[in-house]
């Protein structure tokens, strides 16, 4: 499906006429798109510990380990985004993998991702059964990094 950007509103073909309760096929294809985390998410409850693993995915081996948290909006493309959540306030020692080093801080690395929101077309709410895709930047934390603390002057 091609996108046309028009005055801040991205239209699917014909600005997407659709019937209530019957989503057009294009929308179902679009809305089911998601940005998956590098590793599958576990939906079980578990206490995520502040430690660097010896094996496993990057996010658990890092000295600033993080977990992924779901951000779901059915009216957004992509529908699912994953935010990195730092598991430690400081960085983990490379030697032990568990002791924290107060000389380093574990902080999220942010990225402004382009997303599209499904909206009524401007000035047409409640009239034509059409919708528009509005392009926006959305802040997502990609990973956690180990940084030296800022020194206040």
């Amino acid at each position: 499906v091609s996108l046309r950007i028009q005055e801040g509103c991205s239209h699917l073909p014909s600005c997407c006429p659709s019937k209530e309760q019957e989503p057009p096929e294009e929308w179902l294809k679009w809305s089911s798109a998601s940005v998956s985390p590098p590793e599958p998410l576990s939906h079980t409850h578990h206490a995520e510990s502040c430690r660097a693993s010896k094996d496993g995915p990057l996010n658990s081996r890092a000295i600033s380990p993080w977990s992924y948290e779901l951000d779901r909006d059915l009216n957004r493309v992509p529908q699912d985004l994953y935010h990195a959540r730092c598991l430690c306030p400081h960085c983990v020692s490379l030697q032990t993998g568990s002791h924290m080093d107060p000389l380093g801080n574990s902080v999220p690395l942010y990225h402004n991702q382009t997303v599209f929101y499904r909206r009524p077309c401007h000035g047409e709410e409640g009239t034509h059964r059409r919708y528009c895709l509005e392009r926006r930047l959305y802040r997502v934390s990609l990973a956690c990094v180990c940084v030296r603390p800022r020194v206040m002057a």
Epitope: E22, L28, S31, L70, R72
Partner: antibody, heavy 125, light 108 residues
Amino acid sequence: QVTLKESGPTLLKPTQTLTLTCTFSGFSLSTSGMGLGWIRQPPGKALEWLAHIWWDDVKHYKPALKSRLTITKDTSKNQVVLTITNVDPVDTATYYCARMGQLHYYGYDYAMDYWGQGTLVTVSS
Amino acid sequence: DIQLTQSPSFLSASVGDRVTITCSASSSVSYMYWYQQKPGKAPKPLIYRTSNLASGVPSRFSGSGSGTEYTLTISSMQPEDFATYYCQLYHSYPPTWTFGQGTKLEIK
């Protein structure tokens, strides 16, 4: 038409596990965008959202209660089950299940558009 | 977590009165939803996506607002409108549904 009905014990003792079942008809929980949530209301108090399960089995829980809650679905039986472990008298409430997933021309709604009649659960020693 | 604060918590009104209930969010949100609940009954959807009336809801009900401030207005109170009203929002990250503490509308 869409109907939902909650079932479960009416009286529990503290520390026991509460298992509530929502049996629904008139829609399918395998339809993209569909979801079902549990909401409770202590006597004379406000509504409190507890948990939600989507068509694709993704689950969300109220953060403060996450360790005690589990939500599951059986699409073939048209049922959603909520379990609450280690109940306390403060868990005494009317428990509702409600559907979410109404699709309009402009997108999905996050309103609970259909509700069950609720089931009163009392926790007392 | 986003908090919702409804005001007032209690409101006495007469038939024919114009009534406004406010719902304030602790941070900016896209949409607000409103429900009506009568004693011993399940909540009933009233307004979805801030300003759209749910099916079968009389036109005397209306919703408006943006950002952190949202309102539910009843243009002319009717006897069947005396009930408790709740606002609700959905937050996508982390995915949570939040309700206001309710506004009880009583007959003056």
